[in-house]
Interface confidence: low
């Protein structure tokens, strides 16, 4: 009596080690195909067929200008990506059978998007503006404006700002204020102008000096022997032709005029190296 | 049978010019790169230039650019080469090199037999 | 500028197996060529995309490409094999040639 339940257990273990339950996952680098568990193939293999009760997954190797990067199950390998020069891409990195080929762009461009299937011609930072950073195959040229003290007086995906000239480092003066476009322009310090700055400064005090001594000899000058009740001070009225009184501004603007202004040695305009085609 | 036939070498004093031909038959001249290397007398390989099958992007060798220009005409089946201001040392055999492709992956499978170009005064 | 450097000669005994070496930085990241050039004539091309073969190169001709060397191996060396041998890669917009290895078949 007690040996039929016995029997049942015993066949009912026999039956599920034949039997197994059929697996609902697989460990790692395998796949579940018809109720069983088979191993992917390797980077670089393609399947050619699945395992079996008792056959191994077949795999063969990727073909040429092919690649499969995973651990995988694909019947069919994937082209490498052609870089296409008609697009301005070459090849960074060739492919493998297990890596894909990496494009980048040619010198002088820069890819359109991550993926860089395209390029474009580097973009140049126009006069007013320096290159901040140099393009690369990935990026384009980053522009900044030229700063107070610095100027760019090209177009160039290449050159920063340039800082203006120190005229004093040179013993020159300045002739011209510069601009973010454009350099000082310095001047020689003519003996001849200093010749005839000087005097016309000590003109100018001289002048100043007689009027003063005028103004005096008319306050002291008594108009009327009787005394007078306490009068208001009149407006003096200084004649326009008193010595001295306005040749500054004419002879001053006259030298400055005929100063001769000089460009800097070794300051040129500067020519944007040729960009590439 | 494909073939290239360069033509148009010679002599030349320095600071000449030159212009070689490469008539090109046997194949689709459109569809593929074509390239200009030479061989100084004695010395090794030296590229000079290459021109992509249609949009006409070019490059050059630092030796020649600024001197020498590649282009080409498809519709005769022509790849061409402007030498200006040459020197002594472009003295050599200029070979036309047909491309294995579009572009420069399949290295240079079919050569012409090469002109030469002697710059001396 | 890039530089490919090869041995100026290479000998091998007729049979044995010659090995002509190119090196180049990262030059297993680049596709190499490799060039035959006997005297007074044009160059052929023997291996290119590193080890492809073209058609009518006989197959003792083969061709490596990894890390800082190209290798272009001739097995079964025979006494036509003798000539001057160029590698060749693509690096960033220009074509760059090495200076050539003298193979001698004694």
């Known amino acids: 009596m007690v040996r039929l339940p016995l029997q049942c257990v015993l066949w009912g273990c026999l039956l599920t080690a034949v039997h197994p339950e059929p697996p609902t996952a697989c460990r790692e680098k395998q796949y579940l195909i018809n109720s069983q568990c088979c191993s992917l193939c390797q980077p670089g293999q393609k399947l050619v067929s699945d395992c079996t009760e008792f056959t191994e997954t077949e795999c063969l190797p990727c073909g040429e200008s092919e690649f499969l990067d995973t651990w995988n199950r694909e019947t069919h390998c994937h082209q490498h990506k052609y870089c296409d020069p008609n697009l301005g891409l070459r090849v960074q990195q060739k492919g493998t059978s297990e890596t894909d080929t990496i494009c980048t762009c040619e010198e002088g461009w820069h890819c359109t998007s991550e993926a860089c299937e395209s390029c474009v011609l580097h973009r140049s930072c126009s006069p007013g503006f320096g290159v901040k950073q140099i393009a690369t195959g990935v990026s384009d040229t980053i522009c900044e404006p030229c700063p107070v003290g610095f100027f760019s007086n090209v177009s160039s995906a290449f050159e920063k700002c340039h800082p203006w000239t120190s005229c004093e480092t040179k013993d020159l003066v300045v002739q011209q204020a510069g601009t973010n476009k454009t350099d000082v322009v310095c001047g020689p310090q003519d003996r001849l102008r200093a010749l005839v700055v000087i005097p016309i400064i000590f003109g100018i005090l001289f002048a100043i000096l007689l009027v003063l001594v005028f103004i005096k000899k008319v306050a002291k000058k008594p108009t009327n022997k009787a005394p007078h009740p306490k009068q208001e001070p009149q407006e003096i009225n200084f004649p326009d032709d008193l010595p001295g009184s306005n040749t500054a501004a004419p002879v001053q603007e006259t030298l400055h005029g005929c100063q001769p202004v000089t460009q800097e040695d070794g300051k040129e305009s500067r020519i944007s190296v040729q960009e590439r085609q | 049978e494909v073939q290239l036939v360069e033509s148009g070498g010679g002599l030349v004093q320095p600071g000449g010019s030159l212009r070689l031909s490469c008539a090109a038959s046997?194949?689709?001249?459109?569809?593929?790169?074509m390239s200009w290397v030479r061989q100084a007398p004695g010395k090794g390989l030296e590229w000079v230039s290459i021109?992509?099958?249609?949009?006409?992007?070019?490059y050059y060798a630092d030796s020649v650019k600024g001197r020498f220009t590649i282009s080409r005409d498809n519709s005769k089946n022509t790849l061409y080469l402007q030498m200006n201001s040459l020197r002594a040392e472009d003295t050599a055999v200029y070979y036309c090199?047909?491309?294995?492709?579009?572009?420069?992956?399949?290295?240079?499978?079919?050569w012409g037999q090469g002109t030469t170009v002697t710059v001396s005064s | 500028s890039y530089e490919l450097t090869q041995p100026p000669s290479v000998s091998v005994s007729p049979g044995q197996t010659a090995s002509i070496t190119c090196s180049g930085d990262?030059?297993?990241?680049?596709?190499v060529s490799w060039y035959q050039q006997k005297p007074g004539q044009s160059p052929v091309v023997v291996i290119y995309?590193?080890?492809k073969r073209p058609s009518g190169i006989p197959e003792r001709f083969s061709g490596s490409n990894s890390g800082n060397t190209a290798t272009l191996t001739i097995s079964g060396t025979q006494a036509m094999d003798e000539a001057y041998y160029y590698c060749?890669?693509?690096?960033?917009?220009?074509?760059?040639f090495g200076g050539g290895t003298k193979l001698t078949v004694l």
């Open positions: 990262k030059l297993g990241d680049k596709y």
């Open positions: 090199a047909k491309e294995g492709g579009d572009y420069y992956y399949y290295g240079m499978d079919v």
């Open positions: 995309q590193d080890s």
């Open positions: 060749q890669a693509w690096v960033s917009s220009t074509v760059v």
């Open positions: 046997g194949f689709t001249f459109s569809s593929y790169a």
């Open positions: 021109i992509n099958n249609n949009v006409g992007r070019t």
